[in-house]
Interface confidence: medium
């Protein structure tokens, strides 16, 4: 069998809500994956499991089942949403995310995703992880790959 390629494209959107009393932030993060089938037969995407980490703590998990079939030599783009909660020992982030005296409230999140594909009774798992910027201060729709976190110093604009 030829390879099945999974490419994490990036964050598509992040929708934020708050609970002021609990000092909690709720972020619904929609991500985009490209899955390419390089085989001459169809493969089934059985499930996608994803989790999001902030500061080495898992803040959200999601699982999608029986997602789609990908035809021979075809590619499909799949969006999946991970609901996340920043609370409890991370409630200090509430102040940062609601602070009006800064324009962008970017936090760095680690996106982890595992795609399970099946063909002819054989299962294969492919995992990816990527650091991404997400603005926790407002609802944001991103151009694909716009939110990528590069661990290098950027020159000042």
């Amino acid at each position: 069998p030829r390879s099945i390629e999974v490419k994490y494209i990036g964050v598509k959107s992040a929708y934020v809500s708050y609970d002021a009393e609990k000092r909690t932030i709720y972020l619904n993060i929609t991500n985009t994956l490209n899955i390419t089938n390089n085989n001459y037969y169809s493969v089934e995407v059985e499930n996608i499991t994803a989790q999001v980490q902030f500061s080495k703590t898992v803040i959200g998990k999601a699982r999608l089942n029986n997602i789609t079939n990908i035809g021979p030599l075809d590619m499909k783009q799949i969006d999946y949403t991970v609901p996340t909660v920043i609370a409890e020992e991370m409630s200090y982030m509430y102040d940062f995310c609601t602070l009006l005296s800064i324009k962008v409230h970017n936090i760095v999140l680690m996106m982890q995703v595992t795609v399970t594909t099946a063909y002819f009774g054989h299962s294969e798992q492919i995992s990816q992880e990527r650091y991404q910027y997400v603005d926790c201060g407002r609802n944001t729709t991103y151009q694909l790959a716009q939110s990528e976190y590069l661990n290098v110093l950027q020159p000042q604009q």
Partner: antibody, heavy 118, light 107 residues
Framework: EVQLQQSGPVLVKPGASVKLSCKAS????????MNWVKQSHGKSLEWIGV????????SYNQKFQDKATLTVDKSSSTAYMGLNSLTSEDSAVYYC???????????WGTGTTVTVSS | DVQITQSPSYLAASPGETITINCRAS??????LAWYQEKPGKTNKLLIY???TLQSGIPSRFSGSGSGTDFTLTISSLEPEDFAVYYC?????????FGAGTKLELK
């Protein structure tokens, strides 16, 4: 059409408090910050502070920190500014102005004249 | 706080002329300067933001330039409705601050 309709002129005595209102229409109230600006007679504009109607977060110009209190009522799409311990220095026209995350003011209110006099 | 010095405070001109109004910031505000028009009986109007971006619906005779500390509003080929008071405002950092205003009057 986006509009910010402010309450009518008020005459108050020194030491009193007042609450000004700014009713928004023509847009989703929680999508834009609401700023308040003071214009004393014959003077320029002074930014008082800002509130995010979405979550109630506020930021004040330090000069007005103890003078103004910003609140919102999402159900009526109305922003409020309370002014306390009024003196003649507080006599001015007060504007609400909505803005985005880049801190300029898209649409201004009609203005409310506050006169403090005994 | 960032101080904004606006000049001139008063300007007389005739329709058809081109005028410029200047604002200088006490320290760099990158490109983040906005311009507003104030007219009696009307609500204040945003003309330009981020130094040079024209707000939608504003005629192209209005233009802004500058970055860092020095900025200019230019109104080319003045129309009768352009006679008003103009303010600049820095939107780079809190607290937001304004220039003292320029009154543009008919000569």
């Amino acid at each position: 059409e986006v509009q910010l309709q402010q309450s009518g002129p008020v005459l108050v005595k020194p030491g009193a408090s007042v609450k000004l209102s700014c009713k928004a229409s023509g847009y989703t109230f929680t999508d834009y910050y609401m700023n308040w600006v003071k214009q004393s007679h014959g003077k320029s504009l002074e930014w008082i502070g800002v509130i995010n109607p979405y979550n109630g977060a506020t930021s004040y110009n330090q000069k007005f920190q103890d003078k103004a209190t910003l609140t919102v009522d999402k159900s009526s799409s109305t922003a409020y500014m309370g002014l306390n311990s009024l003196t003649s220095e507080d006599s001015a026209v007060y504007y609400c102005a909505n803005g985005n995350y880049d801190w300029y003011f898209d649409v201004w209110g009609t203005g409310t004249t506050v006169t403090v006099s005994s | 706080d960032v101080q904004i010095t606006q000049s001139p405070s008063y300007l007389a001109a005739s329709p058809g002329e081109t005028i410029t109004i200047n604002c200088r910031a006490s320290r760099s505000i990158s490109k983040y300067l906005a311009w507003y028009q104030e007219k009696p009986g009307k609500t204040n109007k945003l003309l330009i933001y981020s130094g040079s971006t024209l707000q939608s619906g504003i005629p192209s005779r209005f233009s802004g330039s500058g970055s860092g500390t020095d900025f200019t509003l230019t109104i080319s080929s003045l129309e009768p409705e352009d006679f008003a008071v103009y303010y600049c405002q820095q939107h780079n950092e809190y607290p937001l601050t304004f220039g003292a205003g320029t009154k543009l009057e008919l000569k």
